[in-house]
């Protein structure tokens, strides 16, 4: 089984703007359950100097807190280093800047290493279109359908968006 991992066409700048989280997956289910460290939702992204800047929404005490993160470029074109609940090897797996983005992270927190994947879309009304691609990427990295959580509007801090 071979294929090309798709990198952003025309540069990272095309990833700038609003995004919506649609689905999460992990080999450690606690990480993506409500109140899990990686039960977080993308709000927007921008790119500068090859680095990715993201605003994420984190559910906290019944509200959603916006937090800014930066994923720093590395020598590998689709890989970034991110500090969030430890160190993360963050990979852009599939990208269509106008439609959807699939990323996954190998997270190191204390002595534990975990795998987390995230599907985000530009237009929530089309989220079903991209779930098969997400399932396919998850399968490629050893995450199965029963390890995927599809988010609802209530889940993803919709009320906290500007």
């Amino acid at each position: 089984q071979e294929g090309n991992h798709e990198e952003p066409q025309g540069g990272l700048e095309e990833l700038s703007g609003r995004w919506h989280s649609v689905a999460l997956a992990s080999n450690k289910s606690d990480l993506i359950k409500p109140w899990g460290h990686f039960r977080v939702f993308i709000h927007s992204m921008s790119a500068k100097d090859g680095n990715l800047h993201g605003d994420i929404l984190i559910p906290q005490d019944g509200q959603c807190e916006k937090v800014s993160l930066t994923a720093f470029k590395t020598a590998t074109s689709n890989k970034f280093d991110l500090e969030y609940w430890g160190h993360n090897d963050l990979y852009l797996a599939e990208v269509d800047p106008k439609s959807y983005l699939i990323l996954y992270m190998i997270n190191q927190y204390n002595d534990d290493t975990s795998l987390v994947a995230h599907l985000m879309v530009r237009d929530l009304s089309r989220q079903q279109d991209f779930l098969p691609a997400f399932e396919s990427v998850c399968e490629d990295i050893g995450l199965h359908k029963d390890q995927i959580v599809v988010l609802s509007d209530d889940d993803r801090c919709q009320g906290s968006r500007d």
């Epitope: 991992h5 590395t74 590998t76 890989k79 160190h87 090897d89 797996a93 190998i106 534990d112 290493t113």
Partner: nanobody
Framework: EVQLVESGGGLVQPGGSLRLSCVVS????????MGWYRQAPGKQREMVAI???????NNVDSVNGRFTISRDNAKNTVYLQMNSLKPEDTAVYYC????????WGQGTQVTVSS
């Protein structure tokens, strides 16, 4: 193009040990997380162990304490030391370079049988 060449498999008795190796080319090895996966006949391919770019590791519960993943960045090689092997460990074992999720090597067959 990423290439992955696995070796070290074979036939071993229950309780025995094997050390698998995977040589990676076409990517910046030291920059990337790596993993070992396996696929038994009629089953889904499953993750066995992962190692981050900074060397931290994780094994799935079924092999914890028996299997150890490690890496040698100077040799572009990732290893899987498998001890106390059981018949249920019989599978084709594959390594993974996380920078290229769709690429797989040919795998190496591990058979645990008396």
């Amino acid at each position: 193009e990423v290439q992955l060449v696995e070796s070290g498999g074979g036939l071993v008795q229950p309780g025995g040990s094997l050390r698998l190796s995977c040589v990676v080319s076409g990517s910046i090895f030291s920059d990337n997380a790596m993993g070992w996966y396996r696929q038994a006949p009629g089953k889904q391919r499953e993750m066995v162990a992962i190692i981050s770019s900074v060397g931290t590791t994780n094994n799935v519960d079924s092999v914890n304490g028996r299997f150890t993943i490690s890496r040698d960045n100077a040799k572009n090689t990732v290893y899987l030391q498998m001890n106390s092997l059981k018949p249920e460990d019989t599978a084709v074992y594959y390594c993974k370079d996380f920078s290229a999720p769709r690429y797989w090597g040919q795998g190496t067959q591990v058979t645990v049988s008396s």
